[in-house]
Interface confidence: low
């Protein structure tokens, strides 16, 4: 039988009236167009809702735009736009919201050819109030605010200048100008490339990597000869330029550019790239473009100073500079991320890794599937997921894989079951374990989201006909109840809830089309009379986090702990509630030499976890610069893999290698950089 | 030097249960996991599980899950061992031993595995009527 | 559980000769196995572990092989002190299990 319409699955008493009770209708009174949407703050209820007409006239496009605000999670809403005096807002530029709960907001608005400046609206209290603010410049950016300071703004102009604001975008000051790309780092540091001769793009690889420390006063430049830079984690890294030829390789630097060591990476040509797909405060996870366009690289994971890298991944699939990767972050559970490869046949296919890169395996096939006609093997296959790539290809799937840090072990995404990634169209499955074990959800495509930290998954059909029906579940997908949230159905655009999937309230958003006019309708659905009750201690059970073998006494040890979390159990139908917190126990595990990667200039044979040196570099100089400077580089062949808290145990212990290196980088070494003051 | 060693002999009755302990010295107790093996007379030698010194978690083999208990006092770097409901088959030497794998038993094929290096002396337990 | 096979059930060698043990696994246990020596009235001793590397203080004649399911302990040439019941030992996958063994008896 089809998921959630077995004998097993009990109904929701009187879920109906409940739900009735709790739908709200809001019609807006716009004309189509385009709509966005943006929570101000978390847990503030607030939401900002932008929508925009174009009327093409034969000269010109006229604009109009509305701004809507609700202060109870979508339930209701009022017009807004008289706040910004009813100006054309600009949506490429979006609404930019303030960090935290700040309250901040700022809208960037269109303005008259002829104007010195563009305009801007700005709130700092939670968009009660705007205040209209005409610019210096005109922004070719979104501001940007600062992560520690939300008074500090940054933005770029469209003349290339770097324009900074320390009162919340009342007064700016150009710092800097020749800038092609800007972004804060910590402590309200800026980071910034400046091009010398003609133009970002003539002076690609010949840009110059500042970096100011106070808002413009005084500058240090930190790097030449510079193609982009990147911030991940507490890493700074920077694509240098070779001296002789046009390859150019990654330098990276953990005290914000005052010195740099080369990255244990292969160097790239003009037509590939650098992408860092995934950073913390530990490692990276690095993707470097096969040469040709081939579509594919590879993922190199870091140690923790982000110099050395082990190969992670082959034959990652990366189809271009800014293009489209499957890689995706399982934030549910510690340690799991999902990707494509491109195999040898051209087809794709998924692979996870469960212990941050250190190995990666096919999906377990779901047990309540079969294998479809890309399996060679009709009872041997396994699950791969659809994700950016399939999205841009146009296929069947209204959305990317979905997980939540509070909805523990939960993974949703659509998927086919096979040798590979079908062109078919998809199901949804589900895994409640962090992607070891999956089952169908949902047959046909759906749009998906978790709501009070999983107690409810919420679930709308992907059709091109109008819909008015919505499906619930509140057992992690298991048994699923369908809702008729109106008489009137409309065509769907989106599913909006609050960040954090901490809310109990879902918005269904779309449009209403009759014969004269078609308008903008919003449903908000709160859920919490479906979920009457607190959960209690009795509705939570133990789960065991990363569990294959329960026989084995490390069963769950993953880089050096493993972690114990109380559960909800899928039979309680209670409310885990805004405030809920993941209760976890971690417990520390004996180290092993899985527990540490090899070292520069030592690797692991097949099947072997001892690191053993290089051949090819015995008795050589190494491309290994660290700091810029000619030093020794002593190593016992094994360094502890970034974040892994095992103790005890193994402790490798090496005849200490005496590595003399050499720089073939000229990257600016620290007694060559200079600094500067306004 | 490292050495494990072990409470004296036992005589216990059917149904009774018996703990014998480890000292573990000569070595950082914490850096080892301890093993428990027996034999019955004039058998091979059988896992019964596994403890982490470290936090105490145990594994024990599905023969003896619910009758055995490992525990560790790492002030007086002990570990011990309590079977209970004994039984005549029960009659063996008891043996601790040093596993100092580190390892995920269940983990990938590259883990490496460094034996049970250090053993005790054995514990003899009769089970008898 | 996994299974671990040893053959033959007693091996009759004189001093100075080779002798070669069998230790056959049900499943994979990829390098994860140990070798022990076990003398009437003591407690095993550790021979070799991860299938091929010998234990601290163990003499060279003393080999192991193997990976995956097969291995071999191999003993160049038979001392008298060499005589005893030798086990195979997996840790692949809990529980930990041991062969039944194999006796090396004087010929």
């Known amino acids: 039988s089809a998921p959630g319409e077995d004998e097993e699955c009990g109904r929701v008493r009187d879920f109906v009236a409940k739900l009735a009770n709790n739908t709200h209708q809001h019609v807006f009174d716009d004309l189509r167009g385009s709509v966005s949407l943006s929570w101000v703050g978390d847990s503030t209820g607030v939401i900002l809702v932008l929508t925009t007409f174009h009327v093409p006239l034969v000269i010109m496009t006229f604009g109009q735009s509305k701004l809507y605000r609700s202060e109870d999670y979508g339930k209701n809403f009022k017009d807004i736009t008289d706040l910004i005096n009813n100006t054309f807002i600009r949506t490429e530029f979006g609404m930019a919201i303030g960090p935290e709960n700040s309250g901040k907001v700022v809208l960037t608005a269109e303005v008259s050819g002829g104007s010195r400046g563009g305009r801007i609206f700005r709130s700092s209290d939670f968009a009660k109030n705007f205040v209209q603010t005409d610019l210096p410049f005109h922004p070719l950016t979104q501001m940007m605010y600062s992560p520690q300071n939300s008074d500090y703004l940054l933005a770029l102009s469209t003349e290339n200048g770097l324009w900074v604001s320390k009162n919340f975008g009342g007064k700016w000051e150009e710092i800097h100008k020749a800038v092609c790309l800007a972004k804060w780092g910590s402590d309200n540091t800026i980071f910034f490339t400046t091009y010398a001769n003609g133009s970002c793009k003539a002076d690609l690889g010949a840009l110059e990597l500042w970096r100011t420390s106070d808002l413009g006063k005084s500058f240090k430049t930190i790097g030449v000869k510079i193609y982009s830079f990147g911030l991940g984690g507490r890493f700074l890294f920077a694509s240098v330029m070779a001296d002789k030829d046009t390859t150019r390789r990654i330098h990276v630097s953990t005290d914000q550019g005052d010195t740099w060591s080369m990255a244990q990476l292969p160097s790239v040509g003009q037509e590939q790239f650098y992408s860092i797909l995934a950073a913390n405060d530990d490692m990276v996870f690095m993707h470097v473009d096969e040469p040709g366009d081939t579509g594919f690289g590879t993922i190199f994971t870091s140690d923790d100073r982000g110099i050395v890298y082990s190969k992670s991944l082959d034959r990652h699939l990366y189809t271009t500079t800014g293009g489209e990767t499957d890689f995706t972050n399982v934030t549910s559970l510690r340690g799991v991320y999902i990707t494509s490869v491109l195999s040898e046949d051209n087809s794709i296919q998924t692979m996870i890794t469960f212990d941050q890169g250190g190995r990666w395996t096919h999906l377990r096939k779901p047990e309540n599937s079969e294998c479809d006609a890309t399996a060679k093997n009709k009872n041997e296959c396994s699950l791969h997921i659809h994700a950016s790539y399939s999205i841009s290809q146009k296929l069947n799937v209204p959305m990317a894989p979905l997980s939540e840090p509070n909805a523990v072990g939960i993974v949703i995404a659509h998927g086919s079951v096979g040798d590979a990634i079908s062109v078919m169209v998809p199901d949804v499955y589900i895994s409640d374990d962090g992607g070891y074990s999956w089952t169908k959800m949902l047959e046909g495509p759906h749009y998906y989201t978790i709501l009070d930290s999983g107690g409810i998954i919420v679930a709308i059909e992907h059709s091109s006909r109008p819909i008015n029906v919505i499906k619930f579940s509140t057992d992690e997908g298991q048994c699923w109840q369908t809702y008729t949230f109106t008489r009137d159905p409309i065509y769907f655009t989106g599913l909006a809830s609050e960040p954090g999937a901490r809310s109990m309230n879902i918005s269904i958003w779309g449009f209403t089309e009759s014969f004269l006019t078609s308008q903008w309708v919003s449903y908000t659905i709160d859920f919490k009379d479906i979920l009457e009750r607190n959960c209690e201690e009795k509705d939570y059970t133990i789960w065991l986090a990363h569990s294959t073998d329960p026989e084995d006494y490390e069963d769950g040890c993953i880089l050096g702990y493993k972690e114990q979390f109380l559960r909800l159990r899928k039979s309680s139908v209670c409310q885990n509630g805004r405030d809920y917190v993941v209760t976890k126990q971690p417990s520390i595990c004996l180290c092993s030499l899985e527990d540490f990667l090899c070292d520069f200039g030592y690797y692991r044979p097949e099947n072997d976890s001892k690191c053993v040196e290089q051949p090819e570099l015995k008795g050589h100089d190494l491309e290994f610069c660290l700091y810029g400077r000619e030093e020794h580089l002593t190593t016992n062949g094994y360094r502890k893999i970034p974040g892994d808290k095992c103790q005890g145990g193994v402790n490798p212990v090496r005849e200490v290698k005496d590595l003399k290196k050499k720089c073939t980088s000229n990257f600016l070494s620290p007694e060559k950089q200079n600094s500067k003051s306004n | 030097q490292v050495q494990l060693v072990q409470s004296g002999a036992e005589v216990k009755k059917p149904g009774a249960s018996v703990k014998v302990s480890c000292k573990a010295s000569?070595?950082?107790?914490?850096?080892?996991?301890m093993s428990w093996v027996r034999q019955a007379p004039g058998q091979g030698l059988e896992w019964m599980g596994i403890?982490?010194?470290?936090?105490?978690?145990?594994s024990y083999a599905q023969k003896f899950r619910g009758r055995v208990t490992m525990t560790r006092d790492t002030s007086t770097s002990t570990v011990y061992m309590e079977l209970s409901s004994l039984r005549s088959e029960d009659t063996a030497v008891y043996y601790c031993?040093?596993?100092?794998?580190?390892?995920?038993?269940?983990?990938?094929?590259?883990?490496?595995?460094?034996?049970?290096?250090?053993w005790g002396q054995g514990t003899t337990v009769t089970v008898s009527s | 559980e996994i299974v671990m096979t040893q053959s033959p059930a007693t091996l009759s060698v004189s001093p100075g000769e080779r002798a070669t043990l069998s230790c056959r696994a049900s499943?994979?246990?990829?390098?994860?196995l140990a070798w022990y020596q076990q003398k009437p009235g003591q407690a095993p001793r550790l021979l070799i572990y991860?299938?091929?590397t010998r234990a601290t203080g163990i003499p060279a004649r003393f080999s192991g092989s193997g990976s995956g399911t097969e291995f071999t302990l191999t003993i160049s040439s038979l001392q008298s002190e060499d005589f005893a019941v030798y086990y195979c030992?997996?840790?692949?996958?809990?529980?930990?299990?041991f062969g039944g063994g194999t006796k090396v008896e004087i010929k």
């Open positions: 030992q997996q840790a692949r996958l809990g529980p930990w299990t």
């Open positions: 000569g070595y950082t107790f914490t850096k080892y996991y």
């Open positions: 031993t040093r596993d100092p794998s580190g390892i995920a038993a269940a983990g990938p094929a590259s883990r490496y595995y460094y034996g049970m290096d250090v």
């Open positions: 403890i982490n010194p470290i936090g105490g978690s145990t």
């Open positions: 499943q994979s246990v990829s390098s994860n």
């Open positions: 991860g299938a091929s």
